[in-house]
Interface confidence: low
């Protein structure tokens, strides 16, 4: 259904408030360094133009594509070359190359100051003084730091952010009411950003087929009562939504997501019995709720998979006639029977099945050749099961902080070339798998753990892609999306690594560490731990533990001292010397 004016179409579908918010997100995700005021000005200009097109779709320029309109607007920024360097060259290109060029310059780790949370009273005053600007600033700050954040979901976060301030700024104890809510939004927001980043990486690096396979597996687990044709339709629509959002087409994405939610709710009887509550909510909450809905119960008496996919004499005929459809059916049937498997495991099984059929359907006796294909699945299933069991035992024994430290050491030894901040960030997140997943019963552990690890390892991959330093990371990140985790698990100590020169400055600490939050203090200690391993990759657990225990005691002692700075200077020298001796440096 072609519209004379795409911008008018989207403005009418989404409404002015959502239109403005989504354009702001889009611009902030493209031009991540531009000041807030500049973006607001651009958004207002686009909005005014959109209104003229709503009034008269035949007006000048109203027939232009959204990419053309938005790109032209971004290219009016006067400081583009000084601020963004070669990104300014994008403006010399025509659409669609110009948009592709902007997409390639999105920065997963922009050089922006850390967001510091002001005092509660200061925030409440700002909220009351100008609620609209306050909420726009939230969208802007999140979008520029997370250039792939799922835009319609960010509108949902902004709605919750507004609700938190509306409620808590009237409360007797504003801080007690507001701070936990903001912490929750921050943590959920980081998780949401990372999950969406994996979806975009899947689409951009491995293609639509890889994303669709992921979606078939996940939706089949979630909606096991839905028929294959229904799941296929949802997968097609969901792929369109995420392709649009990952491609910067945020207005189309939000519009299509709303349509998909509407379709799901209108057809919930043939999709899932768990959707009723979600479908009673307003649009943003509804879409979020559907995305997070629990798995429906599996239909009773599902027949054995072997009948259709191993025992049948028509396997090769069915495969040859429509390979992707047949493999999609295999994945659907396997996934709906296995909510206890991770999506990536299901995809590995499907890949193994595909590989076997490719080989066997060309063999003299295909049936004999693929008869034992399900036997090949056993080690693939056992590998993540064993890994999760071992790591949950370790987590329960150590607790989260020490478990993170064990992973820090493990990953620094595997890929010591990776920057220390990246190793700390990624290992801390990997370590959170313990508290997130190990509490679950066996049947929920693997989907929780391995699919979460896929998200975290993707963070490592996108950060490493910006500044590649390790061939091993590149190999694990680029060879196979579903085998990233096993690839990293299989890495041993990098024997080719030349230890870093010892630099006492790295291990010099000051009194400011005493005023840090517990989390920030942990990060300081974990940064030191990574550096230690980089200096002495062959250090034993016992040696590292001894040095870290000394370090903890040193910080505790100096933070209690009257003259903290002198204590840090003098005791620090002793600690460095003792650590060097302990590690044989």
């Amino acid at each position: 259904d072609a519209h004379k004016s795409e911008v008018a179409h989207r403005f009418k579908d989404l409404g002015e408030e959502n239109f403005k918010a989504l354009v702001l997100i889009a611009f902030a995700q493209y031009l991540q360094q531009c000041p807030f005021e500049d973006h607001v000005k651009l958004v207002n200009e686009v909005t005014e133009f959109a209104k003229t097109c709503v009034a008269d779709e035949s007006a000048e320029n109203c027939d232009k594509s959204l990419h053309t309109l938005f790109g032209d607007k971004l290219c009016t920024v006067a400081t583009l070359r000084e601020t963004y360097g070669e990104m300014a060259d994008c403006c010399a290109k025509q659409e669609p190359e110009r948009n592709e060029c902007f997409l390639q310059h999105k920065d997963d780790n922009p050089n922006l100051p850390r967001l510091v949370r002001p005092e509660v009273d200061v925030m409440c005053t700002a909220f009351h003084d100008n609620e609209e600007t306050f909420l726009k600033k939230y969208l802007y700050e999140i979008a520029r730091r997370h250039p792939y954040f799922y835009a319609p979901e960010l509108l949902f976060f902004a709605k919750r952010y507004k609700a938190a301030f509306t409620e808590c700024c009237q409360a007797a104890d504003k801080a007690a009411c507001l701070l936990p809510k903001l912490d929750e939004l921050r943590d959920e927001g980081k998780a949401s950003s990372a999950k969406q980043r994996l979806k975009c990486a899947s689409l951009q690096k491995f293609g639509e087929r890889a994303f669709k396979a992921w979606a078939v597996a996940r939706l089949s687990q979630r909606f096991p009562k839905a028929e294959f044709a229904e799941v296929s339709k949802l997968v097609t629509d969901l792929t369109k939504v995420h392709t649009e959002c990952c491609h910067g087409d945020l207005l189309e994405c939000a519009d299509d997501r709303a349509d998909l939610a509407k379709y799901i709710c209108e057809n919930q009887d043939s999709i899932s019995s768990k959707l009723k509550e979600c479908c009673e909510k307003p649009l943003l909450e509804k879409s979020h709720c559907i995305a997070e809905v629990e798995n429906d119960e599996m239909p009773a008496d599902l027949p054995s998979l072997a009948a259709d996919f191993v025992e049948s004499k028509d396997v090769c005929k069915n495969y040859a006639e429509a390979k992707d459809v047949f493999l999609g059916m295999f994945l659907y049937e396997y996934a709906r029977r296995h909510p206890d498997y991770s999506v990536v495991l299901l995809l590995r099984l499907a890949k193994t099945y595909e590989t076997t059929l490719e080989k066997c359907c060309a063999a003299a006796d295909p049936h004999e050749c693929y008869a034992k294909v399900f036997d090949e699945f056993k080690p693939l299933v056992e590998e993540p099961q064993n890994l999760i069991k071992q790591n949950c035992e370790l987590f329960e024994q150590l607790g989260e902080y020490k478990f993170q430290n064990a992973l820090l050491v493990r990953y620094t030894k595997k890929v010591p070339q990776v920057s220390t901040p990246t190793l700390v960030e990624v290992s801390r997140n990997l370590g959170k798998v313990g508290s997130k997943c190990c509490k679950h019963p066996e049947a929920k552990r693997m989907p929780c753990a391995e699919d979460y690890l896929s998200v975290v390892l993707n963070q490592l991959c996108v950060l490493h892609e910006k500044t590649p330093v390790s061939d091993r990371v590149t190999k694990c990140c680029t060879e196979s999306l579903v085998n990233r985790r096993p690839c990293f698990s299989a890495l041993e100590v990098d024997e080719t690594y030349v230890p870093k020169e010892f630099n006492a400055e790295t291990f010099t600490f000051h009194a400011d560490i005493c005023t840090l939050s517990e989390k920030e203090r942990q990060i300081k200690k974990q940064t030191a731990l990574v550096e230690l391993v980089k200096h002495k990759p062959k250090a034993t657990k016992e040696q590292l533990k001894a040095v870290m225990d000394d370090f903890a005691a040193f910080v505790e002692k100096c933070c209690k001292a009257d003259d903290k700075e002198t204590c840090f200077a003098e005791e620090g020298k002793k600690l460095v010397a003792a650590s060097q001796a302990a590690l044989g440096l």
Epitope: K351, E354, T355, E358, V373, K378, P379, K475, P486, C487
Partner: antibody, heavy 120, light 110 residues
Framework: EVQLVESGGGLVQPGGSLRLSCAVS????????MTWVRQAPGKGLEWIGT?????NTNYANWAKGRFTISKDSTTVYLQMNSLRAEDTAVYYC????????????????WGQGTLVTVSS | DIVMTQSPSTLSASVGDRVTITCQAS??????LAWYQQKPGKAPKLLIY???TVASGVPSRFKGSGSGTEFTLTISSLQPDDFATYYC????????????FGGGTKVEIK
């Protein structure tokens, strides 16, 4: 120590059979695919076949029917039947990819090879 | 089946020379290509995998490049230990021939 040791080579008459063994140590066959490769005197490398972690086999077209790969917990075997003079070669076993790669991978670890001579 | 064509079959060079060996696949294999070095009477040794990734313990003078059907192994400055035969190998499990080796390139002293 991670290593592969081939054995079972020797002189065999045309039309005869031979079974080569590849003993592995330092890793588990349930986690790695194993491949047999041969090299005729003065010639290049030639892939024979591969056995996956689950025991499925994949052969070069020329090897199908005469060559069979199997394994137990620590050893990989190559059964060669109806041998011909042109099968004279050094036979190597090599370790392929980690279990979770459904695809084939590079051969990162090789045995020292065992010589098979087919002659009357 | 995939056929790997390696050239040249023999190459005469001196210590310090920059040496280039090429390998052509009969159909696209993405980046699924490995390079091996073999010395007389010894087993092959993995040098490069995934077209450009240098294997553990291999000197940095060895460099792999290419994707699709055209691949290159470059030795930036030939050392005495580098005189050997080099093989390329595709590994594509989706084809009926999982592994296909090139014919080899013998690098000898000029």
């Amino acid at each position: 120590e991670v290593q592969l040791v081939e054995s079972g080579g020797g002189l065999v008459q045309p039309g005869g059979s031979l079974r080569l063994s590849c003993a592995v140590s330092g890793f588990s066959l349930s986690r790695y695919a194993m491949t047999w490769v041969r090299q005729a005197p003065g010639k290049g490398l030639e892939w024979i076949g591969t056995i996956t972690t689950g025991g499925n086999t994949n052969y070069a077209n020329w090897a199908k029917g005469r060559f069979t790969i199997s394994k137990d917990s620590t050893t990989v075997y190559l059964q060669m039947n109806s041998l011909r003079a042109e099968d004279t070669a050094v036979y190597y076993c090599a370790r392929g990819g980690y279990v979770s790669y459904a695809d084939a991978t590079e051969l990162s670890l090789w045995g020292q090879g065992t010589l098979v001579t087919v002659s009357s | 089946d995939i056929v790997m064509t390696q050239s040249p079959s023999t190459l005469s060079a001196s210590v310090g020379d920059r040496v280039t060996i090429t390998c052509q696949a009969s159909q696209s294999i993405g980046s699924r290509l490995a390079w091996y070095q073999q010395k007389p009477g010894k087993a092959p040794k993995l040098l490069i995998y995934y077209a450009s990734t240098v294997a553990s313990g291999v000197p940095s003078r060895f460099k792999g490049s290419g994707s699709g059907t055209e691949f290159t192994l470059t030795i930036s400055s030939l050392q005495p230990d580098d005189f050997a035969t080099y093989y390329c190998q595709s590994y594509d499990y989706s084809s009926s021939s999982s592994y296909a080796f090139g014919g080899g390139t013998k690098v000898e002293i000029k």
